[in-house]
């Protein structure tokens, strides 16, 4: 029998008598077979932390910089339960740290360097820790004590609870430095009311904290949000500018064996029984002996955090930096306006043999990382294991979903200006063989499917989106009597016509040989009655133009599409006979990264790009014997983007509603744990 | 196709030298990128020196300081100098020019590296 039960760490005489009590409530509700809760005590929340780890307990609530310290080897424990706050139709599990500044004081923020700050309190995550850390490393040296750098950048300050003895500049606009509501600029509302009276020039608070204080449009007008690419925003925009976004609170546990299916089960039946307004006898979000026990006592109920959610993506990527800025205090020798090397992301062994020999000509300028998936690419890139990717349309979707930007798109014809005019984008087709002369759009119920790969743009987005709107339902491996899309459940029928031996078969990576546009074409070719990819395939890879032994004596005569008017066409009729148009692939990286990618990429587009015309004696950015590794073969240039700076903007609307309405079906992971951050 | 052939490995210990050769069965100098890689048992063939037909290097962080490569265009052969050994650095390495494209496994025998006291 599987043991059920869930042992709850506590850090006080309080929250264990509180544990033991939410112990023997559970029980009285809940089945016997079902989950109960044991109680393990500790002196703190790092003793809690090294206790799970040890397999000593199973579960504790933690802050933020607590998850982070969670995470931290050796204990390696991840986020699995959120407490959210607000209305169970508008749950915020989330706050967002703000810099505040007046609407006419006219500096950004790489400008802060000699303004006044007004903060919450020494110590606290908005106010202090998130704005502190990311500014580290501006701080001038030696930055320890930290308050002595912190003094010395600022003209002058108030920082609740500094010692105003030794840092006297910290309690500059706040005599006294007091470290209660005593001392009028002490809190969010302090630090904000700082900055309102015109002590400060910027306070460092939480987003809510202007929309508490200042009722009023017309007054919160009066001020913007700085933002970390050196912009500003209206306050209300502060999912798109702010300093970090930081969790409220959080069960975590262990990442192996941790129990997190059974840790949700029971909170999520606490919070049936005993959550907000449901008894009266014992409440989850109550603390009669204390506050904040075991949970907040503002807390409104519990979110389960997607599985694929780590605790870097769970804290996100700007939270990490602040707090291992403080922690580690490490800083490049010296901070130069010269851009780092762009660590490019490789996926699988071929993409990285390429992105190695692109390392070794661009003496310095790219690194390689590599991962065996373009959603475990795109998580590195969010966590700053990786800089930069070039992604198809779909994948554009979900980087941008998780808070990636284009820099620069893929053209695929040549042009006079060709980095200066981003294309409208290339056609989605169904291929078939012409030998299969009854085979049409409207009856391919039963046949064959090949697909480039789940969650790519012509190989899936584009056609399912279309198959969804005709059948309403998910099923697609019950449509088609089997199939090769890389990225699907390994025993569903869509990965039964796959080649990839072993654990690679049905990988979407070029270990699997019918991945992507050269290998669904291929899988029609061997195995298929129908092939969706673009329309450049079949030509690239007929009359001789691919030599691999499976395609060097096709004919692209022998092949023809399918219209969605349910008629057939040859394949050179494109323009009139397509599923859609997509988006082009396009490079993407964090904000941060934005204009370094950018300038990296120009400079070795001119480089090793499609100017270079001997590929056998020079490194060819744009080449890989039709396999489309790293950027697609047929890509003439990166382009600048120009106002297409967003995944909405650069996808399209068109697209973007497409792909949000195949969300129903879909399996990314990685899409559910970002959406999550940003429902 | 140019075949190469990998030689100069052995048993050496820790703070040793080894010289690594790389000779080609035809020009090289014409071969836009040559390199090292080494693959230690149980892990992924990782990148430790490359050289461009320029003379431009690049070296993995973890030799960085301790190993050259060079090439020899009139003898067709590709170097590895490895001074101050570690154990770390036992793998079998090998050299390839990348014109093979990046698709099909085409690593040749390699060389045996053990660095052991």
């Known amino acids: 029998v599987p043991d059920k039960t869930v042992r709850w760490c506590a850090v006080s005489e309080h929250e264990a008598t509180k544990c033991q009590s939410f112990r023997d409530h559970m029980k009285s509700v809940i089945p016997s077979d079902g989950p109960s809760v044991a109680c393990v005590k500790k002196a703190s929340y790092l003793d809690c932390i090294r206790a799970i780890a040890a397999n000593e307990a199973d579960a504790v609530t933690l802050d933020a910089g607590l998850v982070y310290d969670a995470y931290l080897a050796p204990n390696n424990l991840k986020p699995v339960v959120a407490e959210f706050y607000g209305s169970k139709e508008d749950p915020q599990t989330f706050y967002y740290a703000v810099a505040v500044v007046k609407k006419d004081s006219g500096f950004q923020m790489n400008q802060l360097r000699g303004k006044k700050s007004c903060h919450t309190g020494l110590g606290r995550s908005a106010g202090w820790n998130i704005p502190i850390g990311l500014l580290y490393c501006d701080l001038p040296e030696p930055r320890k004590p930290l308050e002595k750098a912190v003094a010395n950048f600022f003209s002058g300050s108030c920082a609740p609870c500094a010692d105003g003895t030794d840092f006297p500049q910290l309690c500059q606009l706040c005599p006294g430095c007091g470290c209660s509501t005593l001392n009028q600029y002490f809190g969010y509302s302090g630090a904000f009311k700082c900055l309102k009276d015109g002590a400060g020039d910027v306070a460092f608070v939480k987003h809510s904290t202007i929309f508490e204080n200042l009722a009023n449009k017309a007054d919160r007008d009066q001020y913007e949000l700085l933002c970390l690419d050196n912009t500003r925003k209206p306050v209300d925009e502060y999912k798109d500018c702010h300093l970090a976004q930081v969790p409220s609170h959080t069960v975590v546990a262990r990442s192996m064996g941790g129990k997190e299916d059974l840790i949700w089960e029971l909170l999520n039946q606490a919070q049936e029984h005993f959550g907000k307004d449901k008894s009266k006898e014992f409440q989850l979000f109550s603390s009669p002996h204390g506050k904040d026990l075991l949970f907040k006592d503002s807390a409104h109920g519990f979110l389960k955090v997607p599985p694929r959610m780590d605790a870097k993506m769970y804290l996100g990527y700007e939270y990490v930096t602040a707090i291992r800025n403080l922690r580690e205090g490490t800083c490049p020798e010296a901070p130069t306006d010269e851009c780092k090397p762009v660590k490019w992301c490789a996926l699988s062994h071929h993409e990285r043999l390429k992105c190695d020999e692109w390392s070794v000509n661009s003496v310095g300028k790219i690194e390689c990382v590599s991962a065996e998936t373009t959603e475990d690419c795109i998580a590195k890139i969010m966590n700053g294991e990786a800089d930069a990717m070039s992604l198809d349309g779909g994948f554009v979707y979900i980087a941008g979903k998780c808070g990636l930007v284009p820099v620069l798109a893929e053209n695929y014809n040549k042009s006079d200006n060709c980095e200066d005019t981003p294309e409208a984008g290339y056609f989605a087709i169904a291929v078939v063989k012409k030998s299969a002369s009854d085979l049409t759009w409207d009856n391919l119920k039963g046949k064959k499917s090949c697909h480039t790969a789940v969650g790519r743009t012509a190989g899936w987005n584009i056609p399912m989106g279309l198959l969804y709107n005709k059948i309403n339902h998910c099923r697609f491996d019950e449509f088609f009597s089997e199939g090769c899309a890389p990225g699907s459940k390994k025993d569903s029928s869509l990965c039964k016509l796959c080649m990839g031996s072993g654990l690679n078969l049905c990988e979407p990576n070029n270990k699997e040989g019918y991945y992507g546009y050269t290998g669904a074409f291929r899988c029609l070719v061997e195995k298929g009655d129908v092939a969706f990819v673009k329309h450049q395939t079949v030509p690239q890879n007929t009359g001789g133009k691919n030599p691999d032994p499976w395609a060097k004596n096709l004919n692209e005569k022998d092949y023809e599409l399918l219209c969605l008017d349910g008629t057939r066409k040859p394949v050179e009729e494109y323009a009139n006979c397509h599923l859609a148009r997509a988006p082009n692939h396009a490079v993407v990286t964090r904000k941060d990264k934005e204009a370094c990618v950018h300038k990296i990429l120009r400079q070795q587009q001119h480089l090793f790009g499609s100017n270079v015309t001997d590929c056998s004696g020079n490194f060819c950015l744009f080449r890989s014997e039709t396999k489309d590794l790293l950027f697609r073969d047929d890509t003439v240039c990166l382009a600048k983007l120009h106002d297409r700076n967003t995944y909405e903007k650069y996808l399209g609307e068109e697209y973007v509603k497409a792909v949000g309405n195949l969300r129903k079906c879909s399996t990314s992971s990685l899409l559910e744990a970002c959406t999550f951050r940003r429902p | 196709e140019v075949q190469l052939v990998e030689c100069g490995g052995g048993l050496v210990q820790p703070g040793g030298s080894l010289r690594l050769s790389c000779v080609a069965s035809?020009?090289?100098?014409?071969?836009?990128?040559m390199a090292w890689y080494r693959q230690a048992p149980g892990q992924q063939r990782e990148l430790v020196a490359g050289i461009t037909r320029g003379g431009s290097t690049k070296y993995a962080d973890s030799v960085k300081g301790r190993f050259t490569i060079s090439r020899d265009n009139a003898k067709n052969t590709l170097y590895l100098q490895m001074n101050s050994l570690k154990p770390e650095d036992t793998a079998v390495y090998y050299c390839?020019?990348?014109?093979?494209?990046?698709?099909?496994?085409?690593w040749g025998q390699g060389t045996q590296v053990t660095v052991s006291s």
């Open positions: 035809g020009s090289i100098a014409s071969i836009a990128t």
């Open positions: 390839t020019d990348y014109s093979r494209g990046y698709y099909q496994d085409y």
